[in-house]
């Protein structure tokens, strides 16, 4: 449980006691210079208009200099993703300074306090920086403010405060309560940076979000539409954060962001790419796998600088685990007739052959609904790199897997007993990949049977003309 | 070099309290958590806890929490562990360790405490 | 809580060959693992930390490998020294938990 000051003081003392008396407290905020990969290394605690802990611990004025910034805690300790983080900034950036911001004694309160202490915990990065700057060759451009949760908000207050502009503050998963439509001065914002990228991935439209619902930055990325994070098991936590416990599921779906980003070091020759869209649905849909005018990007570290004129949203699916990448699959079927539908959506799986590998049966999530004469658009994504696509495997279930279904084909069957077989024709499936940006069209293996119904499957070949690329742009980027 | 150095044996009755202090040296204290982790004969190590001596921020393992106290006199680079309520299945062997920077490796240890509940 | 089990729960092995011991966490615990050997009336000490990362003063011939929920500690060429009980740890969330430990002994 949170625990108060003890004898160090409450901040408010602290910033009101006269000088004399302020040298004899503790800085509530601590900076640590990580000079070694090792965890048992103490660091050197840098502090403002000290210069020799910066030449005791080889401070690298020309490199990139990452300041690392937790959030709020219940307890004194640091979490586990700290290390991993910091471990993965040295593996990627060897000469890099990486700095943790340990404002511990102000984020282990209640949440109420802590989100009041972050304005402080941002001035004081914002001095830290200011004097830096006075040092030849420190360029705040080859800053990167990386904060987590309330940290997030953290890096905006600094660098709102700072004299200048940072070169990058990455947001993971920005805290929700007190910061939801909050004014841009309050809360992360893509003026506190040159570049501002954020990663949503305990977002709820219901109950309490823990994470930041709206866009904060000049990216936005929303991986599995920035709720429900694969492998992080129950999703129905609604508890208070101020005075309660955090499960473990909320833990997992909150710091997937932190992981994401980690993922995006550790394994940059197996970069996630992220989609440009105006909403969730329509990233279901499988609408938005473009990369065209700056549409797509790498997510976490990789991520291409994109001043966009106003926020932009990007969405992608992910793994459970690392390492994250999905391959993304627009699929695209034009059902040309429809006989007896009734009340039912069909439910559809696919599977995927290709050179390297074949995929699992995948489910086509019905956003909507099935429309006729009509083309309808999915999207599919498979764990393993499937190399070029071969031939594609649609099935119709058979029998209803939902109580919902059997209800209403119960219903139906009772207005329409002698309801003849349901049907439906597909002479084509187009192909897109997200990744790739290549489009493939297939085409039914024998023309003269294009009709699926349920319990049936119905085979599609590569057509003749292959693969066509139509100048779409590759989702590959420069690595910073 | 690191020591860590606990305070001597106890034998307490059920019912009772019993606090174990850890002093260390060697080290800059208030830069490391401590924490303490207890043996019972013949069984696992159970982690009870840890402090941030820094400021004395605490987690607490649930199984202990409403039993265990972990404080700090940084004055004497001390950490003391409190067990109220003491049960038989309490006797064990209680050590303090040191953690890294992010407190989840032990790479210092005190000696142990030995701390038998009898009535 | 995440629960660490280790195996076998006695390992009997002759001084001279390699020793091999696991550690399998309940769920994924990436690389927050670190395992202690302890002897008779001793503090434990600390072999491995994060899986596979070496401690100063600790024989080479120990080594860690593994992430995620499976591990493995490796004793290349067992000394007199090295019989005892080695425990696992996991770090990656509270409360931090130990395995129940293997017993090494001389065969």
């Known amino acids: 449980s949170p625990v108060p000051f003890g004898p160090e003081g409450r901040l408010e003392d602290k910033l009101h006691k006269p000088k004399a008396t302020q040298t004899e407290v503790k800085p509530s905020v601590r900076f640590n210079l990580r000079t070694s990969k090792d965890p048992e290394h103490e660091g050197c605690y840098l502090s403002v208009g000290h210069s020799q802990p910066l030449e005791d611990c080889s401070f690298n004025m020309t490199a990139k200099t990452f300041f690392i910034i937790h959030g709020w805690t219940m307890s004194g300790i640091f979490e586990n993703w700290l290390h991993k983080l910091v471990s993965a900034l040295h593996t990627r950036e060897k000469d890099a300074n990486v700095v943790v911001v340990d404002w511990l004694p102000l984020a282990h309160q209640l949440y109420t306090d802590a989100v009041n202490n972050t304005r402080v915990v941002g001035h004081s990065i914002a001095r830290m920086l200011d004097w830096l700057q006075e040092k030849d060759d420190f360029s705040l451009g080859n800053v990167h403010l990386i904060g987590y949760s309330l940290g997030a908000h953290v890096a905006g207050y600094a660098g709102n405060f700072v004299k200048g502009t940072v070169g990058r503050i990455t947001g993971l998963d920005p805290a929700g309560p007190m910061f939801e439509g909050a004014d841009i001065h309050k809360r992360l914002s893509p003026d506190d940076a040159d570049f501002v990228d954020v990663l949503h991935t305990y977002t709820r439209s219901f109950g309490l979000s823990i994470g930041i619902q709206m866009p904060v930055g000049h990216i936005d990325i929303y991986p599995n539409g920035g709720d429900f994070q694969p492998g992080c098991g129950l999703n129905d936590v609604l508890g208070s954060i101020a005075y309660g416990t955090i499960t473990e599921v909320v833990k997992c779906e909150h710091e997937r962001a932190v992981h994401l980003f980690v993922d995006s070091l550790v394994n940059q020759d197996k970069p996630s790419f992220a989609f440009q869209c105006t909403d969730s649905n329509r990233f279901k849909k499988g609408i938005c796998l473009s990369c065209r005018k700056n549409r797509c990007n790498s997510i976490g570290y990789n991520a291409k600088k994109m001043r966009n004129k106003r926020n932009s949203k990007m969405y992608l699916k992910t793994r459970a685990g690392m390492p994250f990448r999905v391959y993304h699959y627009q699929m695209k079927i034009h059902v040309f007739s429809y006989k007896n539908m009734g009340e039912i959506e069909p439910t559809f799986y696919v599977t995927l052959y290709g050179t390297n590998a074949d995929s699992q049966t995948l489910p086509l999530e019905i956003v909507e609904r099935i429309e006729q004469n009509a083309t309808n658009t999915f999207l599919v994504y498979t764990e393993e790199d499937l190399g070029d696509l071969l031939k594609i495997q649609l099935t119709w279930e058979g029998a209803s897997q939902s109580w919902y279904n059997l209800w209403k084909e119960f219903r139906s069957y009772l207005s329409q007993p002698r309801n003849p077989g349901r049907e439906l024709n597909i002479r084509r499936i187009r192909v897109k990949s997200g990744e790739t940006q290549r489009k493939l069209t297939f085409c039914t293996e024998d023309p003269e049977n294009t009709s699926i119904s349920p319990g049936r499957e119905l085979w599609f070949r590569k057509c003749r003309d292959g693969w066509r690329m139509k100048n779409e742009t590759s989702p590959t980027v420069e690595l910073p | 070099q690191v020591q860590l150095v606990q305070s001597g044996a106890e034998v307490k009755k059920p019912g009772a309290s019993v606090k174990v202090s850890c002093k260390a040296s060697g080290y800059t204290f208030t830069d490391y958590t401590m924490h303490w982790v207890r043996q019972a004969p013949g069984q696992r190590l159970e982690w009870m806890g840890g402090?941030?001596?820094?400021?004395?921020?605490?987690t607490y393992n649930e199984k202990f929490k409403d039993r265990v106290t972990i404080t700090r006199d940084t004055s004497a680079s001390t950490a003391y562990m409190e067990l109220s309520s003491l049960r038989s299945e309490d006797t064990a062997v209680y050590y303090c360790a040191r953690g890294d920077y992010y407190g989840g490796s032990y790479n210092y240890w005190g000696q142990g405490t030995t701390v038998t509940v009898s009535s | 809580e995440i629960v660490m089990t280790q195996s076998p729960a006695t390992l009997s092995v002759s001084p001279g060959e390699r020793a091999t011991l696991s550690c399998r966490a309940s769920q994924d615990i990436s690389n927050s693992l670190h395992w202690y050997q302890q002897k008779p009336g001793q503090a434990p000490r600390l072999l491995i930390k994060y899986a596979s990362q070496s401690i100063s003063g600790i024989p080479a011939r120990f080594s860690g490998s593994g992430s995620g929920t499976e591990f493995t500690l490796t004793i290349s060429s067992l000394q007199s020294e090295d019989f005892a009980v080695y425990y696992c740890?996991?770090?990656?969330?509270?409360?931090?938990?130990f395995g129940q430990g293997t017993k090494l002994e001389i065969k």
């Open positions: 740890q996991q770090s990656n969330s509270w409360p931090y938990t």
């Open positions: 402090i941030n001596p820094y400021y004395g921020g605490t």
